[in-house]
Interface confidence: low
């Protein structure tokens, strides 16, 4: 039959060439002389001339060594024709399979691989995967089957078998416990890839394994005991800098310290913060310490890290003995701010109150008093007793010095310590109103027509407080009532001034007496300009000049 089974040819054949592979034969050769030829890639198309056929015998010839990694299979067509060139057979498919030889070494995809793994991980933890390729056949032969192995490990601490590599996948895993970044932060593994599933050619590469930091070292106080001296009353005062050492990676959360006062600070007098650069614990006073109440504090401070510990570690504790130093403390007025009610206008020399200070120091110090700020100069203070008396006229209505009925005075207490210290107190005098002001009309100048005049509405003001104000009463005096009339409107505290009789154009004085609910009377002279006009006027018109 005009059929050829697939032909297997090993690559890299040594010849001699041409080498006979197989014979094409047509059974039509009994009837006529047959000529054979082949076509296809490797014969008459690129790569031309690899194969040929003996024209008359049909022997298929190989002209040169084959390379499987270049072309693994050739598909040719065999042709049979008679002497006159007529085709005697259909083209026949010829398959030539190039069989593999182990002519390639494995190749790693990188010269150096990098990976990382946390320190302290359990054996079995995967680190990284390395890959090597081999161009040889790994399906039908073991020529291209790569087996991975670790040739060496540097450094060999804590021993030389810290890692293993999966023979067929190239996955590097931890095989031993004891990875400690603080001792060895990086390993260099020389890895091998061997073909023939481990029995053939070998190539090497490097795998660098970085050991990442875990919080497996606790911060430790160094030293553990401290003594400090702090002046009493100082707030925000730096008491002590506590120092710790931590073997974990500097500036990482596993290294950064967190401090906590765990004992000895019942009054919440202290606070501790971590210095961002030095990692020290900065112990400061949150409140002022009181020598007289407690002259020594013993604090206990614990340190941990920002990151939690990955294993159970002992917590380091520091002891800080804080000695409170006595300072001459300022006298303190009791109360710091004193409110006293006093009637305005009381006579000079009359007592207002006694305002004294206490000295926190244990010694009985002498305190002297004086007025520090008395804007109107209304008060005096006895330096020994702290007695405050009137030295001027207290005027509730004086808006320069009095706000909302209150007159504010600052007083000073000075002790006889060395050096002397001073304390201040605030005396708030609430001035009680007396009916010392009569009602006053506004405005005090008016303009009005002498024909069909508009009534003038004047506002009534009284600086005193109720009940020394409205209802008001009005009265015209000094014959002003002959031409004028004044009526109080109680609803809006106004007085309506009207012209009763004709007056020629001129300026007149209207004598208006207003009295308040407490009968405090006030006479006001209103300047009235009367104009020759009708009804409403703002300003007198110019006299008419005939032409």
């Amino acid at each position: 039959d005009w059929v050829v089974a697939p032909i297997s040819v090993p690559e890299n054949g040594k010849g001699p060439f041409p080498q006979r592979l197989n014979q094409l034969k047509s059974n039509k050769d009994r009837d006529t002389k047959i000529f054979y030829s082949i076509t296809g890639p490797g014969a008459d198309s690129p790569p031309e001339g690899v194969f040929a056929v003996e024209k008359e015998t049909g022997w298929l010839l190989l002209n040169k060594p084959l390379d499987r990694e270049e072309i693994a299979k050739y598909e040719l067509f065999g042709h049979a024709v008679s002497e006159n060139g007529a085709s005697v057979e259909d083209p026949m498919n010829i398959s030539i399979i190039v069989t593999d030889q182990n002519d390639h070494k494995p190749k790693f995809t990188q010269d150096t691989f990098r990976g990382s793994v946390l320190e302290g991980v359990l054996p079995g933890t995967s680190v990284m995967q390395v890959t090597a390729t081999d161009e040889d056949d790994a399906i039908h032969t073991y020529n291209g089957v790569v087996a991975y192995s670790i040739h060496s490990q540097e450094p060999k601490d804590p021993h030389d078998l810290m890692f293993t590599i999966h023979r067929s996948t190239g996955t590097i895993s931890v095989i031993s416990s004891g990875l400690d970044r603080e001792k060895v932060p990086e390993y260099t593994l020389t890895i091998q890839a061997t073909d023939m599933d481990g029995d053939g050619s070998t190539t090497t590469a490097v795998a660098v394994v970085e050991i990442l930091d875990a919080n497996d070292n606790a911060p430790v106080f160094d030293p553990q005991k401290y003594e400090s001296h702090v002046p009493e009353n100082a707030v925000g005062h730096e008491v002590q800098r506590l120092t710790v050492t931590d073997l974990d990676a500097p500036n990482s959360p596993a290294w950064r310290a967190t401090y906590l006062i765990v004992g000895g600070d019942d009054g919440d007098h202290f606070t501790i913060a971590t210095h961002p650069e030095s990692n020290q614990g900065i112990l400061t006073t949150r409140k002022g310490l009181d020598f007289e109440a407690k002259n020594q504090h013993t604090l206990y401070v614990e340190v941990t890290n920002e990151a939690p510990f990955v294993l159970k570690l002992p917590t380091s504790t520091a002891t800080i003995v804080v000695h409170v130093e006595d300072v001459n403390e300022a006298p303190v007025f009791v109360p710091p701010s004193k409110v006293v009610e006093v009637q305005e206008g009381i006579p000079t020399g009359e007592a207002v109150c006694v305002y004294t200070a206490k000295d926190p120091d244990k010694e009985n110090q002498k305190i002297s008093y004086r007025i520090l700020r008395d804007p109107a100069g209304w008060l005096a203070m006895d330096p020994d007793s702290g007695q405050v008396t009137v030295a001027g006229t207290l005027d509730r209505e004086d808006e320069r010095f009095v706000r909302n009925n209150i007159y504010e005075v600052m007083v000073l207490a000075v002790d006889n310590g060395s050096p002397p210290t001073t304390g201040t107190g605030t005396l708030l005098l609430t001035l009680i109103d007396v009916n010392d002001h009569g009602p006053v009309p506004e405005p005090r100048e008016i303009t009005i027509c002498n024909q069909s005049p508009e009534s003038q509405v004047l506002n009534i003001t009284d600086k005193d407080l109720s009940p020394h104000t409205s209802p008001f009463q009005a009265q015209l005096t000094d014959d002003s009532d002959i031409y004028w009339m004044a009526e109080v409107n109680e609803k809006d505290d106004t007085v309506v001034l009207s012209l009763k009789k004709f007056l020629k154009q001129d300026t007149y004085d209207v004598h208006l007496s207003l009295s308040d609910h407490g009968n405090k009377e006030q006479l006001t002279v209103i300047r009235a300009t009367v104009c020759d006009c009708h009804g409403h006027v703002e300003k007198c018109p110019d006299p008419w000049k005939g032409g």
Epitope: Q110, D111, T112, R114, S116, E154, P155, D157, D180, R181, E182, K183, V184, P185, E186, T188, V206, V208, E210, D213, T245, L247, A249, P250, S252
Partner: antibody, heavy 123, light 113 residues
Framework: QVQLQESGPGLVKPSETLSLTCTVS????????INWIRQPPGKGLEWIGV???????NYNPSLKSRVTISVDTSKNQFSLKLSSVTAADTAVYYC?????????????????WGQGTLVTVSS | DIVMTQSPASLAVSLGERATINCKSS????????????LAWYQQKPGQPPKLLIY???TRESGVPDRFSGSGSGTDFTLTISSLQAEDVAVYYC?????????FGQGTKLEIK
Amino acid sequence: QVQLQESGPGLVKPSETLSLTCTVSGVSITSYPINWIRQPPGKGLEWIGVIWTGGGTNYNPSLKSRVTISVDTSKNQFSLKLSSVTAADTAVYYCARSRGVYDFDGRGAMDYWGQGTLVTVSS
Amino acid sequence: DIVMTQSPASLAVSLGERATINCKSSQSLLYSSNQKNYLAWYQQKPGQPPKLLIYWASTRESGVPDRFSGSGSGTDFTLTISSLQAEDVAVYYCQQYYSYPYTFGQGTKLEIK
């Protein structure tokens, strides 16, 4: 201010052991890795090895059989020992601090160097 | 070992002009996980230790003038001095820290033309 200072004998006989110390000030000795580098007169730089913050070491394979790097935390000092020296070991020897302990700090780059000490190997 | 090759071996540039030094590694210094190139540049003046200028191939060390810049990735790197000053006369070295042992280039001597 971080400072590194190398010290040791300026002259060593062939086949003897070269011993140098590196004194570190201005930073905790256990906070950063320390490298040793050498430079033969008129030539380039050669990395000798590194000691990590926890005491582990990595050495240049070309010198590994002869070199030892160690630390004495009580004295704030690192030491370099190179055995069986020959004239080819004549060089200025430097100690240098790595930028950090982490790979991501660029720990292979060296930011602070000592002034260096010249060691001559001669009989 | 990774071999570092610098070019040129020496270079003469006029004051105020640009100076360029090249460094080639025998294998890639780019680590795919963090996309960083493990390369540093140093300056060494006569009688002094080397001074770190650049790390991660392009990050300037604090205190280094901004006329110094580093570029490149993989196997090809460049140190550029944008406007040469008299005090820049020195030998410049590149160094890889991708894998052990750390290795340096042979150095480039920079002079004023």
